[in-house]
């Protein structure tokens, strides 16, 4: 049900060749109240004007009501993400009503036709909600529409057409093609519900972006930058290249939004946090780990309602599978001086040592370049909770690993053959935990030894809580 190229065939066919046979009946929309976690349980079909199924199936008028809305399909059968989501909602909200919106007849079409059907389906959902509102105790504020891919825009239409305002819409990687840049009334937008939160997991700035790139909610969360999801590379997905196609990678990344949401339901004790940032590059630099003024939020079901004047783009890193939570750290390294740097950027690694665990060796990604006599900010993240940080090992990698760096080194050597050793001086590392917001300062173990060069390491121990040092003016302003 998800993608404009799903896992069931060749890419080039997908936008043009319908898999559905010509339907013999006028297509319609069904509302299946899932009354059990058991995927084989039939559930109950609800229809406007018929109150008996509501009674027969114990529809709880005062409880939360979730409507799950699938997307485009090439198979005419529900994919497994849907039953995972139904089951997770039942586990988390035992008294809630979980309704699956079955619009397969209108979704099992050419992609362009399915897009054109989204408005009709939105109307159907709005009619169902308007009818339910006539019942005593039913509140639109308790309604949460969860739409995946094309279903996210269906949810937007439903929220737009209903009499009143639905409590919440969650868009799970809303579809991109034919919606990117569209007018707000023709796509999911913040005015479709009291709170609209969105997860973007398959956005691409080149080629066809299956998921929408633009922010469309009150908060728009871009896990791993919203594009390359860990565990979804060709090698990860296929296991053996013989058994799969690129479409499985597409499915993996697009569907990741659903699994992140499911994770937030079932792993409540391991919430993932996202941080407001203007763009992915700034986040990768580590300058966006602030929680001041609502700048951070839980992702998925546990997201706190935020109604910003303008869209809030938020970022986080994740693991490759459930539970997806990682621990983010901002590292500020002030480089006091360096010698003979040449053209090549150094390759640094850090190992963090904590009261609970030690991290693996983590690369410091240099987004632009190392600045001297300036504070350089980096983002690192760990899969395990390290506890309180005690010390840090900083390593400057010796031999270059990339051919490009080798070539630059060779060129540098030709122009300056007697190049004395490269070296830079670091006295302190400031660390801020994204999850706890705690700030720590680490000083070199030996105050006399602050220099590091290729193939060498430098050790830092915690020297104080907080960042401000005595008689020191902060060299940089903390950025949002």
């Amino acid at each position: 049900s998800p993608v404009p190229f799903g896992p069931e065939g060749r890419l080039e066919d997908k936008l043009h060749k319908p898999k559905a046979t010509q339907t013999e009946v006028k297509p319609s929309v069904r509302f299946n109240l899932r009354t059990s976690k058991d995927p084989e349980h039939e559930g109950c079909y609800l229809s406007v004007g018929h109150s008996q199924p509501l009674e027969d199936c114990s529809f709880n008028m005062t409880a939360k009501t979730f409507f799950i809305i699938h997307g485009w399909t090439m198979s005419g059968i529900f994919e497994n993400w849907l039953h995972k989501l139904v089951s997770a909602l039942h586990t988390r909200e035992k008294d809630a009503n979980v309704v699956v919106v079955d619009w397969l007849p209108l979704a099992h079409q050419l992609y362009t036709d399915a897009v054109n059907n989204t408005r009709v389906v939105g109307h159907s959902i709005a009619r169902m909600l308007d009818w339910l509102q006539e019942k005593d105790d039913f509140s639109l504020g308790n309604v949460h529409l969860i739409g995946y891919s094309l279903g996210a825009h269906v949810a937007g239409y439903a929220g737009n057409f209903v009499k009143g305002t639905v409590g919440r819409i969650t868009g799970l990687d809303p579809a991109g093609p034919m919606f990117e840049g569209a007018d707000i009334h023709k796509r999911l937008s913040p005015d479709d519900a009291d709170f609209v939160d969105v997860l973007h997991t398959y956005t691409r700035s080149f080629g066809l972006s299956i998921g929408i790139q633009m922010p469309v909610g009150h908060i728009d969360i871009y896990p791993n930058g919203g594009d390359f999801q860990p565990g979804c590379g060709l090698n990860d997905v296929l296991g053996s290249i013989a058994y799969g196609t690129i479409t499985e990678v597409v499915k993996c990344e697009h569907e990741r939004a659903v699994h992140l949401f499911v994770d937030s339901l079932v792993n409540q004790d391991k919430p993932s946090f996202a941080f407001q940032c203007t763009d992915s590059n700034r986040f990768k630099k580590g300058i966006c780990l602030s929680c001041r003024k609502n700048r951070c939020n839980s992702i998925g079901y546990n997201a706190k309602k935020m109604r910003n004047k303008r869209n809030s783009k938020m970022y986080l890193k994740t693991r490759a599978g459930m539970p997806f939570r990682v621990y983010h750290y901002q590292m500020k390294i002030h480089v006091f001086s360096y010698k003979n740097m040449g053209e090549i950027e150094p390759t640094f690694y850090v190992t963090l040592y904590g009261t609970n665990a030690d991290s693996q060796t983590l690369p410091l990604e240099i987004v632009e370049r190392i600045e001297q006599n300036a504070t350089n900010t980096f983002l690192v993240y760990t899969e395990e909770d390290l506890g309180d940080l005690l010390k840090i090992q900083l390593t400057w990698e010796g031999a270059s690993q990339s051919w490009y760096n080798l070539w630059k080194e060779f060129r540098s050597y030709l122009s300056q053959p007697r190049n004395p050793g490269r070296e830079l001086n670091i006295r302190r590392i400031r660390v801020k935990s994204g999850e706890t917001q705690r700030k720590l300062t680490f000083c070199t173990e030996d105050p006399e030894n602050t220099s590091i060069s290729p193939g060498r390491e430098l050790w830092f121990r915690k020297c104080r809580d907080g960042w401000r040092m005595k008689n020191e003016t902060s060299p940089t302003v903390e950025l949002p």
Epitope: A20, V25, P39
Partner: antibody, heavy 120, light 107 residues
Framework: QVQLVQSGAEVKKPGASVKVSCKAS????????IHWVRQAPGQGLEWMGH????????NNNEKFKDRVTMTRDTSISTAYMELSRLRSDDTAVYYC?????????????WGQGTTVTVSS | DIQMTQSPSSLSASVGDRVTITCRAS??????LNWYQQKPGKAPKLLIS???KLHSGVPSRFSGSGSGTDFTLTISSLQPEDFATYYC?????????FGQGTKLEIK
């Protein structure tokens, strides 16, 4: 109780077509999908495709490409599978099977099978 | 397509024996594995769905386990009516695929 009753055995010549029927009873026909699985003599099971009786949407195994056509008649709760351009290696027992609404749902009830023999 | 490989292809056992049949998928199938029993001249019958869920009416001597790519069907104490061919099937990805079968014969 749930029952799937299939049409009788068929003998066909290469190049011909065969149409097998599967009548469902004991449940709401449009609430589950109907799948077709075949088994060549002494061989394993091979999924051919399915139909969603609710609206008639189908999906076929690429192996059968355009040779298989699945239809249904909701008024008599019956699904049909037509296989065209028959070859001798299409000789097999053809089963219809009921499956729930998800990919993961098992084939929980099966028809008794229809033997199709392709021979010149 | 996901390849399903069963082992052994055939096995001989006696009434009362404990028997284990394994099924390996060529990639992770998220525990979406079903087991069927087929007797000569009959249609397959569902035994176990979702790796370990016993279908209604199936005796409790049948059990399923596993995760990721490796799964097993266990019959704790073979009965005369259990001699048949057993198939595993993945429900993770289209096209749905079956193992080649394991024929369980009387020793």
């Amino acid at each position: 109780q749930v029952q799937l009753v299939q049409s009788g055995a068929e003998v066909k010549k290469p190049g011909a077509s065969v149409k097998v029927s599967c009548k469902a009873s004991g449940y709401t026909f449009t609430d589950n999908t109907i799948h077709w699985v075949r088994q060549a003599p002494g061989q394993g099971l091979e999924w051919m495709g399915h139909i969603n009786p609710y609206y008639g949407g189908t999906n076929n195994n690429e192996k059968f490409k355009d040779r298989v056509t699945m239809t249904r008649d909701t008024s008599i709760s019956t699904a049909y599978m037509e296989l065209s351009r028959l070859r001798s290696d299409d000789t097999a027992v053809y089963y219809c099977a009921r499956k729930g609404i998800y990919y993961s749902s098992p084939f929980d009830y099966w028809g008794q099978g229809t033997t199709v023999t392709v021979s010149s | 397509d996901i390849q399903m490989t069963q082992s052994p292809s055939s096995l001989s056992a006696s009434v009362g024996d404990r028997v284990t049949i394994t099924c390996r998928a060529s990639q992770d199938i998220n525990n979406y594995l079903n087991w069927y029993q087929q007797k000569p001249g009959k249609a397959p019958k569902l035994l176990i769905s979702y790796t370990s869920k016993l279908h209604s009416g199936v005796p409790s001597r049948f059990s399923g386990s596993g995760s990721g790519t490796d799964f097993t069907l266990t019959i704790s104490s073979l009965q005369p009516e259990d001699f048949a061919t057993y198939y595993c099937q993945q429900g993770n990805t289209l096209p749905f695929t079956f193992g080649q079968g394991t024929k369980l014969e009387i020793k």
